[in-house]
C-alpha cells in the first residue's frame, strides 16, 4: 500500500484570499483505505472525503492557520502526515515618506507596509537600499506595528513601519533610494520595493539654502517593483518636513517641458507656458488644497493660476502638465518668499 499527500511539503504558506487543496490518498491491497483529516477547525464542506482519499480545501482565511493531520489506515496499518498551514497577507502596499529626499539635510525616511499578516518582526524585514546594496550609515529607528482599521470584523491585519535617519547622501547625490520589505515564510520569500527619489541640483552640489535660486529636479531610476514612475508627481508630498526653501522647480527631464513663472505684481499669479512648437497645450494639474478653489485661465500654450480672493499663494506644490507628451513641471512655493522663475 502507498500513502501520499499532495503537495507533499510539511509546511505550506497560503496567501490570504487564495485557495489551496491538499489531497491525501492511500491505496490498500485488502479493501478500501480509510483516509481522513483531523486537527483543523474546518467549517462544513472544507473537507471532501472519497474512498481512499480526502481533500482538504484551504480558503486562505486566518482560521485556516493550523496543523491538520491526515490519517490513513489500511487493515492494521496506519500512516499519518501533518501539514503546517500558514496563511499570510503581503500585498504590494508600501508607502514611503517623504515622497522625495533632499540632499544636505538631516532627515528621517519612513516605509510602511500595509495589510500585513503575520505581523512578526522575525518574518518581516525592512531594508533601505542604494542600488542593490543596503545604504551604509543609515540608522534604523524603532519599528512600529499598528492594527489596520478593518471595514468588517474578522482578519486582524497590521501595518508595520520602519524609519531610518539618513546619512549624508554625498555629492553627487544618488538618483533614488529604495525601501525593500521582505516577508520570509516557510519555503517562500516575498519582496516588495518602493522608490524614494532624490532631488538633484542642476548647477551646484551644495545643499539648498533659503536664498539660492537654482532649480531642483526630481530624478528617478525605474525598477520593476517600483510603483511610481518617479517623473510625474501626482500627489502632494506628505506634510512637513519638506524644506522651507525659495521656490524650487521639480520637473521631468526631457527635451522640452513647460516653464512656470510667478508674477508678484499680478497678486501672486502663476503662469505656465510651453514653447515646444505648435499644437502644445498646458494646464494646471496640482495645487495645494483643492485645485477647483483657484482661478484658472487656459489658452493653448499658456495657463494662468491665481488665488481667489487675491492674496498670497498657499504654501505647497503646484504642477503644470503639457500635452501631448505629458511632461510636467512642479513648483514648490514655501509662502512669503521672494519668487523665482522655474527653469
Amino acid at each position: 500500500q502507498s500513502f501520499q499527500v499532495n503537495p507533499p511539503e510539511s509546511e505550506v504558506a497560503v496567501a490570504m484570499g487564495t485557495s489551496l487543496q491538499i489531497t491525501c490518498s492511500m491505496s490498500c491491497d485488502e479493501g478500501v483505505a480509510r483516509v481522513h483529516w483531523r486537527g483543523l477547525d474546518t467549517s462544513l464542506g472544507s473537507v471532501q472525503t472519497l474512498p481512499g482519499s480526502s481533500i482538504l480545501s484551504v480558503r486562505g482565511m486566518l482560521s485556516d492557520t493550523g496543523t491538520p493531520v491526515c490519517v490513513g489506515s489500511c487493515g492494521s496499518r496506519s500512516f499519518q502526515h501533518s501539514v503546517k498551514i500558514l496563511v499570510y497577507a503581503f500585498p504590494d502596499q508600501l508607502v514611503v515618506s517623504p515622497e522625495f529626499l533632499v540632499p544636505g539635510q538631516d532627515q528621517v525616511v519612513s516605509c510602511t507596509a500595509h495589510n500585513i499578516w503575520p505581523a512578526d518582526p522575525n518574518s518581516l524585514s525592512f531594508a533601505l537600499l542604494l542600488g542593490e546594496q543596503r545604504l551604509e550609515g543609515a540608522q534604523a529607528l524603532e519599528p512600529e506595528q499598528e492594527e489596520e482599521i478593518q471595514e468588517a470584523e474578522g482578519t486582524p491585519l497590521f501595518r508595520m513601519t520602519q524609519r531610518w535617519r539618513l546619512p549624508s547622501l554625498g555629492t553627487p547625490a544618488p538618483p533614488a533610494l529604495h525601501c525593500q520589505v521582505t516577508m520570509q515564510l516557510p519555503k517562500l520569500v516575498l519582496t516588495h520595493r518602493k522608490e524614494i527619489p532624490v532631488l538633484q541640483s542642476q548647477t551646484s552640489p551644495k545643499p539648498p539654502n533659503t536664498t539660492s535660486a537654482e532649480p531642483y529636479i526630481l530624478t528617478s531610476s525605474s525598477t520593476a517593483e517600483a510603483v511610481s514612475t518617479g517623473l510625474n508627481i501626482t500627489t502632494l508630498p506628505s506634510a512637513p518636513p519638506y524644506p522651507k526653501l525659495s521656490p524650487r522647480t521639480l520637473s521631468s527631464e526631457g527635451p522640452c517641458r513647460p516653464k512656470i513663472h510667478q508674477d508678484l505684481e499680478a497678486g501672486w499669479e502663476l503662469l505656465c507656458e510651453a514653447s515646444c512648437g505648435p499644437g502644445v497645450t498646458v494646464r494646471w494639474t496640482l495645487a495645494p488644497g483643492d485645485l477647483a478653489t483657484y482661478h484658472k485661465r487656459e489658452a493653448g500654450a499658456q495657463a494662468w493660476l491665481s488665488v481667489l480672493p487675491p492674496g498670497p499663494m498657499v504654501e505647497g506644490w503646484f504642477q503644470c502638465r503639457q500635452d501631448p507628451g505629458g511632461e510636467v513641471t512642479n513648483l514648490y512655493v514655501p509662502g512669503q518668499v521672494t519668487p523665482n522663475s522655474s527653469s
Partner: antibody, heavy 119, light 107 residues
Framework: EVQLLESGGGLVQPGGSLRLSCAAS????????MHWVRQAPGKGLEWISY????????NYADSVKGRFTISRDNSKNTLYLQMNSLRAEDTAVYYC????????????WGKGTTVTVSS | DIQMTQSPSSLSASVGDRVTITCRAS??????LAWYQQKPGKAPKLLIY???SLQSGVPSRFSGSGSGTDFTLTISSLQPEDFATYYC?????????FGQGTKVEIK
C-alpha cells in the same frame, strides 16, 4: 565652546517625580538630536531616550517607557527629562548627550546629575 | 535589540604596553560603532566613531578597526592617563546599546 550641563537631580522617594534639565551652549541646539543616558552605581551605560531637533521624533528604552518623558525648548536651548513613578532601579547618574548629524554617535556629553530613589 | 559584548571585562597593563579590547555585536552593525573612555566620576568621552575614525583631539595612539560584528580598540602605547573604563556602543539601530565596559587597570 560646546557645553552641556545637567541639573535637577536629587533624592526622591519611590513613586515620586523629578524633572531633569540639560542646558546647551556653544552650538545651534535645534539642529541636533539629543539623548539621555544613565549609569547606575558601579554599572555600565544605558541609553534611555532621544528627541529629534524639532521634537517630531522621540523614543524610550523599554525600562522607562510610559514613565519618563523627554522634551526640549529650543528657544531656551534646554533639554528635559520628566521622570514619574520612580523606582529604586532608576537610581543613577543621568547624562545628556548630543547626537552627531549624519553619523549618529554621541559626540558631546554633559557632566551628569545624580538621581537617588530611596525611601 | 542588538547585544554588545566586550572582552575582557578588565585587564591589567603597564605604561607603554599595547592594549587591545574587543567588542562583538549580536548582529551586523556595518561600521556604526563608537568607543568611549570614562574615568571615575566623569562623563564618557568619545574616542572613535564609525569603527575607525579618530575623534578630533584624541591622541593617535588610540585606533579602532572592524566591521560587521567584530571590532577592536587598540591603545598602541598605554599612558598613565589612559587608565579608565572603555565602552563600545552600536548606533546602527535603536535602542542604541553599549558594551558592559572594559576596565584598564595599572599592573
Amino acid at each position: 565652546e560646546v557645553q552641556l550641563l545637567e541639573s535637577g537631580g536629587g533624592l526622591v522617594q519611590p513613586g515620586g517625580s523629578l524633572r531633569l534639565s540639560c542646558a546647551a551652549s556653544g552650538f545651534t541646539f535645534s539642529d541636533f538630536w539629543m539623548h539621555w543616558v544613565r549609569q547606575a552605581p558601579g554599572k555600565g551605560l544605558e541609553w534611555i531616550s532621544y528627541i529629534s531637533g524639532d521634537s517630531g521624533y522621540t523614543n524610550y528604552a523599554d525600562s522607562v517607557k510610559g514613565r519618563f518623558t523627554i522634551s526640549r525648548d529650543n528657544s531656551k536651548n534646554t533639554l528635559y527629562l520628566q521622570m514619574n513613578s520612580l523606582r529604586a532601579e532608576d537610581t543613577a547618574v543621568y547624562y545628556c548627550a548630543r547626537d552627531r548629524p549624519y553619523y549618529y554617535y554621541m559626540d558631546v556629553w554633559g557632566k551628569g546629575t545624580t538621581v537617588t530613589v530611596s525611601s | 535589540d542588538i547585544q554588545m559584548t566586550q572582552s575582557p571585562s578588565s585587564l591589567s597593563a603597564s605604561v607603554g604596553d599595547r592594549v587591545t579590547i574587543t567588542c562583538r555585536a549580536s548582529q551586523s552593525i556595518s561600521r556604526s560603532l563608537a568607543w568611549y573612555q570614562q574615568k571615575p566620576g566623569k562623563a564618557p568621552k568619545l574616542l572613535i566613531y564609525a569603527a575607525s575614525s579618530l575623534q578630533s583631539g584624541v591622541p593617535s595612539r588610540f585606533s579602532g578597526s572592524g566591521s560587521g560584528t567584530d571590532f577592536t580598540l587598540t591603545i598602541s602605547s598605554l599612558q598613565p592617563e589612559d587608565f579608565a573604563t572603555y565602552y563600545c556602543q552600536q548606533y546602527k539601530s535603536y535602542p542604541v546599546t553599549f558594551g558592559q565596559g572594559t576596565k584598564v587597570e595599572i599592573k
